[in-house]
């Protein structure tokens, strides 16, 4: 006999919620795998800045995305399938995963706060690599997409360490329309905007982390309530 009433409502709420979560994970994983295995992005491994080999921040970022996408898909599947099948085992595993993820998020939050300067440096390095790839390999549409995402999200363009050719390509092709780069290249420096984000606007990242944590707690409660509802319904 299946669950009834309010518990049934929780069942479908958990299903819908985790299905969206699973889809989002799939999108993230798909994009990350595309970036990782696309020949144009792979060129980043062999890219050189003058005489120095390029750092691999780009790849570290992609591997993090792959891991996040895979975990999201796995956890989403557990929640989805566990809810629809009314499986105490799957829901228990789902709850355990959420507890682990919650602990990871808290640990990552503490680590991130302590290492915010290093993270900002890595994000800047990631931007620089994507920008360099977009200029050197002018067919690298994924690198261009990364650069344009930075420019549009942070409302910036370029940095104070640009080469001549990069400046020219930026001005003519990769800067957001109406950007002040034309009148003064360094008015909207992306490096500065990244620094601002990790110092002055750190609370935004904090709010986002709290929202994710609240959703996790909400899902934990729902999965436990549903698990108890399933146990109770199987008694009768």
């Amino acid at each position: 006999m299946g669950v009834e009433g309010c518990t049934k409502c929780i069942k479908y709420l958990l299903f819908v919620f985790n299905f969206v979560f699973w889809l989002a994970g799939g999108v993230i994983l798909g994009v990350a795998l595309w970036l990782r295995h696309d020949p144009q992005t792979t060129n980043l491994l062999y890219l050189e800045l003058g005489d120095k080999p390029a750092p691999n921040t780009f790849y570290v970022g992609i591997y993090i995305l792959i891991a996040v996408g895979a975990v999201m898909m796995f956890v989403g599947f557990l929640g989805c399938y566990g809810a629809i099948q009314e499986s105490q085992c799957l829901l228990g595993t789902f709850f355990t995963c959420l507890v682990i993820l919650f602990a990871c998020e808290v640990a990552a939050g503490i680590w991130g706060f302590v290492n915010k300067d290093q993270i900002a440096k890595d994000v800047k390095q990631f931007y620089d690599q994507a920008l360099q790839q977009a200029v050197v390999d002018d067919d690298a549409n994924n690198a261009k997409a990364v650069v344009k995402t930075f420019h549009e999200t942070l409302d910036c363009c370029g940095s104070s360490t640009l080469t001549a050719i990069t400046t020219s390509v930026l001005k003519n092709n990769l800067c957001p329309s109406g950007s002040n780069i034309i009148s003064n290249l360094f008015k909207e420096d992306c490096h500065q905007k990244i620094d601002d984000l990790f110092s002055g606007k750190l609370y935004l990242i904090g709010i986002a982390a709290i929202v994710v944590a609240v959703i996790m707690i909400f899902e934990m409660i729902l999965s436990m309530v549903l698990c108890c509802g399933i146990r109770n319904s199987s008694v009768y």
């Epitope: 050197v136 002018d138 001549a164 050719i165 390509v169 092709n173």
Partner: antibody, heavy 119, light 112 residues
Framework: EVQLLESGGGLVQPGGSLRLSCATS????????MSWVRQAPGKGLEWVSY????????DYADSVKGRFSISRDNSKNTLYLQMNSLRAEDTAVYYC????????????WGQGTLVTVSS | QSVLTQPSSASGTPGQRVTISCTGS?????????THWYQQLPGTAPKLLIY???NRPSGVPDRFSGSKSGTSASLAISGLRSEDEADYYC???????????FGGGTKLTVLG
């Protein structure tokens, strides 16, 4: 050895057209930005245009914008400059140059081809 | 009138040290764009002499050196030789004009 060889220069009347070519060898042409730089007789150097490795990006000096067009054929390792509506002030030796991304400059130059615009 | 200003001529005797200046502005050399130097021997194409303010490509003698300070750059030639007689051009990028800019050129004469 890196080699760049320009051709196509000559005498042309004002308002006329000319197409310059630059045959290259000794380096991976298809992965390099290329450029044209000119030098009027007895004068200094003036950058004219550049084109990216796959022709996605290009730019021109204001003095030639709308009249000159840069292009390349990577299968032939050749760079081109289509010059239309030529003026007397376009008279110059036109050099094709490889643009080095790492060094951010023109690291190899051809010997140049003379374009004379006169009636 | 060139965006980068160079003296039109310079001279020296063999063995002497000669310096050629290149003055720009805050939109080119002063904006952090590297200065490069080219040597053009009579009747030939320009040849890269110094890149990135002070680096020498392989094959360029260490008699040639470059430096940059603020909105200016300079090329120094020590132990001057007769084969150094040529035109020297400085080059940078101007962010306001969005063009690669060259100096007007300096004609170096080796006396005696």
């Amino acid at each position: 050895e890196v080699q760049l060889l320009e051709s196509g220069g000559g005498l042309v009347q004002p308002g006329g057209s000319l197409r310059l070519s630059c045959a290259t060898s000794g380096f991976p042409f298809s992965s390099n930005y290329m450029s044209w730089v000119r030098q009027a007789p007895g004068k200094g150097l003036e950058w004219v245009s550049y084109i990216s490795s796959s022709s996605t990006y290009s730019d021109y000096a204001d003095s030639v914008k709308g009249r000159f067009s840069i292009s390349r054929d990577n299968s032939k390792n050749t760079l081109y400059l289509q010059m239309n509506s030529l003026r007397a002030e376009d008279t110059a030796v036109y050099y094709c140059a490889r643009y080095s991304y790492g060094r951010d400059n023109f690291d190899y130059w051809g010997q140049g081809t003379l374009v004379t615009v006169s009636s | 009138q060139s965006v980068l200003t160079q003296p039109s001529s310079a001279s020296g005797t063999p063995g002497q040290r000669v310096t050629i200046s290149c003055t720009g502005s805050t939109s080119n050399i002063g904006a952090g764009y590297a200065t490069h130097w080219y040597q053009q021997l009579p009747g030939t194409a320009p040849k890269l002499l110094i890149y990135g303010n002070s680096n020498r490509p392989s094959g360029v003698p260490d008699r040639f050196s470059g430096s940059k300070s603020g909105t200016s750059a300079s090329l120094a030639i020590s132990g001057l030789r007769s084969e150094d007689e040529a035109d020297y051009y400085c080059q940078s990028y101007d962010t306001n004009l969005s063009v690669w800019v060259f100096g007007g050129g300096t004609k170096l004469t080796v006396l005696g």
